[in-house]
């Protein structure tokens, strides 16, 4: 049936896509999430909103995306920084912009870092900045695995649903 | 068999890749658009030259991807920029560099972005500059959904088949 | 058997995989490469160390990817940069920064690039630099052919495992 | 049904050349590489490289680069090894063998034998 | 070139016994290891892919385990047909090489 094995958000998106389980017999845990606009100096994973979705046993927990079942996985990520010029009177510092989607799992006692892109941005005078920064690839994950991100720059992130975003789906 | 559902083009491609849909039996649909080099100040997609096609029931209308069927589909695109150093006499402007991959849908009576990228550019004096941006994320998709793309910064694109480029595939 | 086909530190991990090739009858080749840290000024892929991996058919040729049947694939890669200040004695030049995957088929008596992103870079004074360089697409490849990497600027890329890596699977 | 037939192998003096032939039929020939893969007398398995009918993609173990080269001709459905400059330690049988995924050899002809003798 | 040892080079063994065969890499090689099967002048056949799976039409008591640089085929319950001489395959890189291979004889 549509929306059997989606999150409620999902199922109700999923019921004006009936065909969505039909290309395959076997289920295809995907998700797609985005930050939340409404928390400005944190970035908080959002499923339940605009053209988010957790399918196939995907869920979010603590902020962090559950693996359904082990295998491979592509996983992706996405920001977008922007910042203003700094003011005469200020001093111009560097500013370092990092965004890395990170592995926690029962083997390590740490997070490991998957994917991972940096910046180092010089804000100049009447100078209005923006940086993007995107990464995906393919992991073999377990049953349990929690994947999330950190971020380093988190005050100047644009955010909306095309701009911040992370996601993951079954190979 | 093989070439079936495939655009003219693409078709040819399939002939001699006749194991092309053996590792499945059900149908996926894929597409990988180039930028068309011949047009210089604007972005025309193409899908019958060099490595780009159309497979299993995409079509490009418009300048849009059709959506074949309903389903979860990886949604990507990649654009580079570039420019040369402002002449000493010419004062040098910010230039807001941008690429979207928006959806447009029967749903709504506008455009939805789901991939945007920005970047500002402060071209110096004997300075070229180069730019990339890359996106990709996973959508719930609708048959019909026309997927298109909007950029500001059109005459600055590096336009080349492996610089440039637009596609989708379902999941 | 769990755990069957992964390097010794995933292998670890797979024993709780289980179910890693239940949610497939058909095999999906994939494969994660990451830059070998050990080679300062070259670019070394390895598949046999950390999270990356060979499945299904994937080879590794003359440090390049052996397509193992016909199809359409998603390739992807990524790199970053960083390079320190240039001294005041010594004159700043700009940086060109590349990369490339290509495909080699004897079909062309080249190497076709498939995916390229590139940048310039301005070393200044007391200023660190980081850039990051991520893209993918879907092709149609055949058996076979060899999937490579180009790359400007080896000497200054940042080589874990997070920020160098090239990839593939089959859709 | 696949089938492989490797035909071309004989008697030949060191220095010689030989055209070795590998017939295939029951698949389309151009949907998968053909390997060689040969194997001295009493001993194992030796990699020799392979060439995809559809492009004429070819990868060769470097042992045999320079005096090995191999071929098809997708009108005749037939794949060739093209062997020069032929050495006593060339004496193997040659089998030519089409794969499944690239590096899995599913599918062997029969062999023939190539003998470098003065 | 990565090199393959199998060991035991031959082995005796009667009907219904549970005979292992073992492969080392001389580095890690994932899990991209093949098994063959080869009667007296004919051809190998492939027994094992990727470590573990079966191809097809291979019986069930063809086993295949291991990954990184140690590998063993495994033989549950010899069958008369079964007495031959095996092979492993690397499949990591090019040049593929195979091991020197293992004579499975009757006791």
């Known amino acids: 049936l549509p929306g059997v094995g989606l999150t409620p958000s999902a199922a109700q998106t999923a019921r004006q896509h009936p065909k969505m389980h039909l290309a395959h017999s076997t289920l295809k845990p995907a998700a797609h999430l985005i930050g939340d606009p409404s928390k400005q100096n944190s970035l908080l994973w959002r499923a339940n909103t605009d053209r988010a979705f957790l399918q196939d046993g995907f869920s979010l927990s603590n902020n962090s995306l559950l693996v359904p079942t082990s295998g491979i996985y592509f996983v992706y990520s996405q920001v977008v920084f922007s910042g203003k010029a700094y003011s005469p009177k200020a001093t111009s510092s560097p500013l370092y912009l990092a965004h890395e989607v990170q592995l926690f799992s029962s083997q390590y006692p740490f997070h490991v870092p998957l994917l991972s892109s940096q910046k180092m941005v010089y804000p100049g005078l009447q100078e209005p900045w923006l940086h993007s920064m995107y990464h995906g690839a393919a992991f073999q994950l377990t049953q349990g695995d929690q994947l999330s991100t950190h971020t380093d720059g988190i005050p100047h992130l644009v955010l909306s649903p095309s701009t911040v975003f992370f996601g993951a789906f079954a190979l | 068999l093989p070439g079936v559902g495939l655009t003219p083009s693409a078709a040819q491609t399939a002939r001699q890749h006749p194991k092309m849909h053996l590792a499945h039996s059900t149908l996926k649909p894929a597409a990988h658009l180039i930028g068309d080099p011949s047009k210089q100040n604007s972005l025309l997609w193409r899908a019958n030259t060099d490595r780009a096609f159309l497979q299993d029931g995409f079509s490009l209308s418009n300048n849009s991807l059709l959506v074949p069927t309903s389903g979860i589909y990886f949604v990507y695109s990649q654009v580079v920029f570039s420019g040369k150093a402002y002449s000493p006499k010419a004062t040098s402007s910010p230039l807001y560099l941008a690429h979207e991959v928006q959806l447009f849908s029967s749903q709504y009576p506008f455009h939805v972005p789901l991939l945007s990228s920005q970047k500002m550019v402060y071209p110096g004096l004997q300075e070229p500059w180069l730019h990339s941006m890359y996106h990709g994320a996973a959508f719930q998709l609708t048959q019909g959904d026309q997927l298109s793309t909007h950029t500001d910064g059109i005459p600055h694109l590096v336009l080349s088949p492996s610089t440039v480029f637009f596609g989708a595939f379902a999941l | 058997l769990p755990g069957v086909g992964l390097t010794p530190s995933a292998a670890q991990t797979a024993r709780q995989h289980p179910k890693m090739h239940l949610a497939h009858s058909t095999l999906k080749p994939a494969a994660h490469l990451i830059g070998d840290p050990s080679k300062q000024n070259s670019l070394l892929w390895r598949a046999n160390t950390d999270r990356a991996f060979l499945q299904d058919g994937f080879s590794l040729s003359n440090n390049s990817l052996l397509v193992p049947t016909s199809g359409i694939y998603f390739v992807y890669s990524q790199v970053v940069f960083s390079g320190k200040a240039y001294s005041p004695k010594a004159t700043s030049s700009p940086l060109y920064l590349a990369h490339e995957v290509q495909l080699f088929s004897s079909q062309y008596p080249f190497h076709v690039p498939l995916l390229s992103s590139q940048k310039m870079v301005y070393p200044g004074l007391q200023e660190p630099w980081l850039h990051s360089m991520y893209h993918g697409a879907a092709f149609q490849l055949t058996q076979g052919d060899q999937l490579s990497t180009h790359t400007d600027g080896i000497p200054h890329l940042v080589l874990s495992p997070s920020t160098v890596f090239f990839g593939a699977f089959a859709l | 049904e696949v089938q492989l037939v490797e035909s071309g192998g004989g008697l030949v003096q060191p220095g010689g050349s030989l055209r070795l032939s590998c017939a295939a039929s029951?698949?389309?020939?151009?949907?998968?590489?053909i390997h060689w893969v040969r194997q001295a007398p009493g001993k194992g398995l030796e990699w020799v490289g392979y060439?995809?009918?559809?492009?004429?993609?070819?990868n060769y173990n470097e042992k045999f680069k320079g005096r090995f080269t191999i071929s098809s001709d997708k009108s005749k459905n037939t794949a060739y090894l093209q062997m020069n400059s032929l050495r006593a330690e060339d004496t193997a049988v040659y089998y030519c063998?089409?794969?499944?995924?690239?590096?899995?050899?599913?599918?062997w002809g029969q062999g023939t034998l190539v003998t470098v003798s003065s | 070139d990565i090199q393959m040892t199998q060991s035991p080079s031959s082995l005796s063994a009667s009907v219904g016994d549970r005979v292992t065969i073992t492969c080392r890499a001389s580095?890690?090689?994932?899990?991209?290891v093949a098994w063959y099967q080869q009667k007296p002048g004919k051809a190998p056949k492939l027994l094992i892919y990727?470590?573990?799976h079966r191809y097809t039409g291979v019986p069930s008591r063809f086993s295949g385990s291991g990954s990184g640089t140690d590998f063993t085929l495994t033989i549950s319950s010899l069958q008369p047909e079964d007495f031959a001489t095996y092979y492993c395959?690397?499949?990591?890189?090019?040049?593929?090489?195979f091991g020197q291979g293992t004579k499975v004889e009757i006791k």
């Open positions: 063998s089409r794969p499944t995924m690239l590096p899995w050899f599913a599918y």
């Open positions: 580095q890690a090689v994932s899990s991209a």
């Open positions: 990727s470590a573990s």
């Open positions: 395959q690397e499949s990591y890189s090019t040049p593929w090489t």
């Open positions: 060439n995809n009918p559809y492009n004429d993609g070819t």
């Open positions: 029951g698949y389309t020939f151009t949907s998968y590489v």
